[in-house]
Amino acid sequence: VPGEAEQPAPELVEVEVGSTALLKCGLSQSQGNLSHVDWFSVHKEKRTLIFRVRQGQGQSEPGEYEQRLSLQDRGATLALTQVTPQDERIFLCQGKRPRSQEYRIQLRVYKAPEEPNIQVNPLGIPVNSKEPEEVATCVGRNGYPIPQVIWYKNGRPLKEEKNRVHIQSSQTVESSGLYTLQSILKAQLVKEDKDAQFYCELNYRLPSGNHMKESREVTVPVFYPTEKVWLEVEPVGMLKEGDRVEIRCLADGNPPPHFSISKQNPSTREAEEETTNDNGVLVLEPARKEHSGRYECQGLDLDTMISLLSEPQELLVNYVSDVRVSPAAPERQEGSSLTLTCEAESSQDLEFQWLREETGQVLERGPVLQLHDLKREAGGGYRCVASVPSIPGLNRTQLVNVAIFGPPWMAFKERKVWVKENMVLNLSCEASGHPRPTISWNVNGTASEQDQDPQRVLSTLNVLVTPELLETGVECTASNDLGKNTSILFLELVNLTTLTPDSNTTTGLSTSTASPHTRANSTSTERKLPEPESRG
């Protein structure tokens, strides 16, 4: 065609896949009458007539474009709907009169790829691989034209590097004409890459300009040999007997080696393997002072059979021995003096305290307690506490009972007990003294005696309330080698008038339980009196 060499560059029309391309015939009125135009598509330099305009009316030609073309803008523009990648070609309009002229339009088609799908090597990468290994893949599906991929490590783009970094990209054409890009990042990794963040970026163009999509960031499992093995003890800080102590082996390799924990035998100085749990942890529970000693860990790489030994670690389980008090069972006369001495061993400095057992009152800070001018009331329990101030909770105690010679001493001299006739009463009487007294009752009934402590005794008596008993009352007598003493229990009949708010309070330690003789015992203390029976 004459003058074809001077053809101007085609007009560029850019459109996204699936949208409508507006192909405006740019012939001027002098070049041709737009009411008489032929439209062609050019593919591989072959022209195909696709649309005719006659007297401003359009008509599609049979073929691939038949259903997708229509006229717009009073016949000057051809609209192509549902654009596909296959539509990327030159379209031309040709005016017929006054002379044959043509106008060329280059249609460019774009489609953003899907979000890149990044996948990491599921088996991981050893640092000593001979060749660069497949680290990760990046797939960008259904883009047009082919997007460009850039790999990043820790936010920096990765460049091809001989024998170190190799990026292998390939693409496949889907039946839709869209491209799927697969990029494989091959690299020789180093130990420091275990924390590296990798991602890929797809760069693509749309009619609106350049765009990019980033994958999620991934880390790669990196395998590297162990260089160092060490022991870790939990809890950290001072350990004491009774604690749960965990000794574990750690290594700086991935995967970690096979661990074993040994303790040095103090007598043979040989290392003896300890039994660990399934996780390779040596659990000492409860920890004892015998667990103290020198521990070390061995890490064995099962691939190379190389064995590494940790620095030995000294473990100290702090303890306090049994506490000894002397004298162990002191007996003294009233008015005399007594010195109590407390001893114990420990892995740390000890602090001693003496406490009164009954009250918890601190009597002395130190291992020696001196008691002068002993009274009967001074008899009873004294506790020595040996503790390690630097280790909270590490202490041992010993109780010593001080006996003061003396006749029985009653918990109460006399008391009133509310009763009902024909009830079984449960009476109690308490006495103390040294030697420990025994208790007897002045009435028949079922009595039982209970030793409360070395100097104290409690006797309980079950007895039926009779008119005679009401008259005589009940006495309990406590006796030992040094004398005797008596407590009196006055029995008072319950009637409605005696049930005043104050009448049911008594003093002392005695409890009385009243129940009808004809019924099974129902136990109640004096503070809650039984309901009086209505006598009809």
Epitope: L123, E134, I184, K186
Partner: antibody, heavy 116, light 106 residues
Framework: QVQLKESGPGLVQSSQTLSLTCTVS????????VSWVRQPPGKGLEWIAA???????YYNSAFKSRLSISPNTSKSQVLLKMNSLQTEDTGMYFC??????????WGQGVMVTVSS | DIQVTQSPSLLSASVGDRVTLNCKGS??????LAWFRLKRGEAPKLLIY???SLQTGIPSRFSGSGSGTDFTLTITSLQPEDVATYFC????????FGAGTKLELK
């Protein structure tokens, strides 16, 4: 086209060593990794070991101490050795090609019976 | 280790049926999941990779979907030759397979 074929003894005595060979064609062992997978009778598939295109070896930790995988690149073969065989090791053994992380082509498998 | 649970273990369907097989990961595996068909005496065949990509040469009646922990293999119109055992496999961390779904004709 891509092909993989497993070969090895059909019957092995317990406590003995099993040697299996995977012969590949249509691709190179320097461009694709290969895995071994087994299927005990009436059970599911279980990954055993792999060798990467770069020559790195990987093992299922359940078998690690008794496995060895190695390539013979010139013969396009991957060899699997499993020692201390037990009757539970009876099953169909497959080799499969990596592309690069999923398995796109498999062999037909070889049946291995471990007799006591 | 990542566990993969397949359901159902047995499925009976008729020719032409739409069939759905499920696979569940014990943790997020993104799209690192493949589906295989296993027939006695044949090499296992890859159907779907990357959760939803159809392997070359596999009929378009097969499709995969899902991401994260829940995945599905769908056969839109069951054919007699589809009778087989189907396995899913995760390749996010190591390689583990589901126990399989045996698909049979009613």
């Amino acid at each position: 086209q891509v092909q993989l074929k497993e070969s090895g003894p059909g019957l092995v005595q317990s406590s003995q060593t099993l040697s299996l060979t995977c012969t590949v064609s249509g691709f190179s062992l320097t461009s694709n990794g290969v895995s071994w997978v087994r299927q005990p009778p009436g059970k599911g598939l279980e990954w055993i070991a792999a060798i990467s295109s770069g020559g790195s070896t990987y093992y299922n930790s359940a078998f690690k101490s008794r496995l060895s995988i190695s390539p013979n690149t010139s013969k396009s073969q991957v060899l699997l050795k499993m020692n201390s065989l037990q009757t539970e090791d009876t099953g169909m053994y497959f080799c499969a090609r990596h592309r690069p992380f999923y398995f796109d082509y498999w062999g037909q498998g070889v049946m291995v019976t471990v007799s006591s | 280790d990542i566990q993969v649970t397949q359901s159902p273990s047995l499925l009976s369907a008729s020719v032409g049926d739409r069939v759905t097989l499920n696979c569940k990961g014990s943790q997020n595996i993104y799209k690192s999941l493949a589906w295989f068909r296993l027939k006695r005496g044949e090499a296992p065949k890859l159907l779907i990779y990357d959760a939803n990509s159809l392997q070359t040469g596999i009929p378009s009646r097969f499709s995969g979907s899902g991401s994260g922990t829940d995945f599905t293999l769908t056969i839109t119109s069951l054919q007699p030759e589809d009778v087989a055992t189907y396995f899913c496999q995760q390749y996010y961390s190591g390689y583990t397979f589901g126990a399989g779904t045996k698909l049979e004709l009613k």
